[in-house]
Interface confidence: low
Amino acid sequence: KSPIFGPQEVSSIEGDSVSITCYYPDTSVNRHTRKYWCRQGASGMCTTLISSNGYLSKEYSGRANLINFPENNTFVINIEQLTQDDTGSYKCGLGTSNRGLSFDVSLEVSQVPELPSDTHVYTKDIGRNVTIECPFKRENAPSKKSLCKKTNQSCELVIDSTEKVNPSYIGRAKLFMKGTDLTVFYVNISHLTHNDAGLYICQAGEGPSADKKNVDLQVLAPEPELLYKDLRSSVTFECDLGREVANEAKYLCRMNKETCDVIINTLGKRDPDFEGRILITPKDDNGRFSVLITGLRKEDAGHYQCGAHSSGLPQEGWPIQTWQLFVNEESTIPNRRSVVKGVTGGSVAIACPYNPKESSSLKYWCRWEGDGNGHCPVLVGTQAQVQEEYEGRLALFDQPGNGTYTVILNQLTTEDAGFYWCLTNGDSRWRTTIELQVAEATREPNLEVTPQNATAVLGETFTVSCHYPCKFYSQEKYWCKWSNKGCHILPSHDEGARQSSVSCDQSSQLVSMTLNPVSKEDEGWYWCGVKQGQTYGETTAIYIAVEERTRGSSHVNPTDANARAKVALEEEVVDSSISEKENKAIPNPGPFANEREIQNVGDQAQENRASGDAGSADGQSRSSSSKHHHHHH
């Protein structure tokens, strides 16, 4: 399948101009290679009409140009002064020959319709309303006023001043005068559909002295906006339907032959195929809203439509906006596991990809919640503190420059199962969705800490050990002290894991951490974990309480950090860069402008890196050591 994308059908009228935008994958080769526009002949040959190499055919001379926009990965073919001869099949493509990667475009140029010379043309979008002005002479002021629609043989009444209304216009048409002006009447028709398009005649009075005016009403289907997105990336549909539908339910649907299947609406309907990867966000009181879909799949490509109606379903005669989404399979976003499995009491390490060109961007992790319109409260971020109910068991490790950051969640419970999003305040295409599945544990955990109920005494030396199985023998072991800003790795020295050993004694593999002397600041959560280079693996957590030597411990040790009540958060993910397209020269607020925490982002992220420097100025030492004991029986 070709990765080139453009409009399948372009229609215009004689004398008009068209502009055709074609998209190509974001690679250096593509940005620099030849772009072309050719016309397909009956023999299958495609004759070049214009190319980025400077070629311009005779029939396009003075009326066409081709412009490459490498920063957008698009090129545009502009053609003016269209004639019916321009109707035909074309290709826009890339490559040194016209047999390269391409996309088929059908161009149809129709004749300008012959209209009576005094015809007033009204051009409106589907679902909108039109107010037709009908002027008349003063002497016809007392006479009947009417509007009729021309059919083949006659003119079928729409509405008249005696309150007669055609059944198909009931509730949609009204005839009125404004103020004291007795020289013009108006007819308003709302909820326009394709069937309303055509020629109308306004009339005041009867017989030869009647005033008549011809009206041509054109009802336009919205031109689909083209969206070119990479596989596994995300897309935002920005829907702006106008103030008149601000209070109606909103929806996004996908065309399926003759129908449009609702994917999500503001009444709580959601297609199961989009579970965990879709949000609908009302933006303001003007009928604007956006729908965000992450983790794009091949099968997400297609024709989408947004609209508004009290039913939350597509309805004829209501305003709509449309898009054609193309999913490019030559994706720059790495293919990562979309499902991560863990067990109760265990841990998961989730590798989140981000655009490597944006290593200083702020990284976040949020939990997708499907209630209402769906939202994704931030749980942790490079400058966002860990949410309270995740205390001691959630941390984000930023590995600047390599295009990945890691989120670790331990002390898993079945309540942790669900969908999570990796996102940054940079390139919004790199939003990814992870489904976390948590099964009941059926065996002992891989990492175990002793003692399990750890209470250290002030001023003394305290050691905790982390036991690991032989399969982790070659991996790097570490201890870190957890805070709500991350888990800072403690300095460690490896006391034997690198010694050559023929066998591995399952019972004796351990890495120890010693606090010497114990201070009040040492109280808190500690993690023992394994990693291979920058790839983090399993972790386990322990809470160390600190008590004074003289009296019994007054500290209540949280034996189950996960038993705390989960707080239902109302905040949502904010990403000031989520708006993929501004549609006013006066900037719009981002679609998530009402949400938490990520608005005041500086250019340079103050990164929360796992630090190796945990030494303190007062001479206390924190150490962890890896020991490989040989037991003699």
């Epitope: 101009s17 009326r63 003016e80 906006e225």
Partner: nanobody
Framework: QVQLVESGGGLVQTGGSLRLSCAAS????????MGWFRQAPGKEREFVAA????????WYADSVKGRFTISRDNAKTMVYLQMNGLKPEDTAVYYC?????????????????WGQGTLVTVSS
């Protein structure tokens, strides 16, 4: 960032003339249809005139045909609206807009960036 700045509005007598200018920046100007729209108090924004990217095609609302002329200077990235024979019903805020290049030159929906507007008042 696309910016459109209109100028040239003001108060004029019936039958008088005005020339509106629109300075565009932040876009490949010579690739886009440009249009003029107007909005009178309490009324919908309505199409006035448009000009194709190269200037070969122009479109006018019936109410201004023969009185208004749209033109452009791609080198200066400017669009102009010459308004002659002004009438009181021409009183409105006039907006310059950048086309989406989607084949519809006369529909509001066919334009994606708008200026702040310039007020034209025609007194009788």
């Amino acid at each position: 960032q696309v910016q459109l700045v209109e100028s040239g509005g003001g108060l004029v007598q019936t039958g008088g003339s005005l020339r509106l200018s629109c300075a565009a920046s932040g876009l490949t100007f010579s690739s886009y249809t440009m249009g003029w729209f107007r909005q009178a108090p309490g009324k919908e924004r309505e199409f006035v005139a448009a000009i194709s990217w190269g200037g070969a095609s122009t479109w006018y609302a019936d109410s201004v045909k023969g009185r208004f002329t749209i033109s452009r200077d791609n080198a200066k990235t400017m669009v102009y609206l010459q308004m002659n024979g002004l009438k009181p019903e021409d009183t409105a805020v006039y907006y310059c807009a950048k086309g989406r290049n989607n084949g519809y030159a006369t529909a509001v929906r066919a334009y994606d960036y708008w200026g702040q507007g310039t007020l034209v008042t025609v007194s009788s």
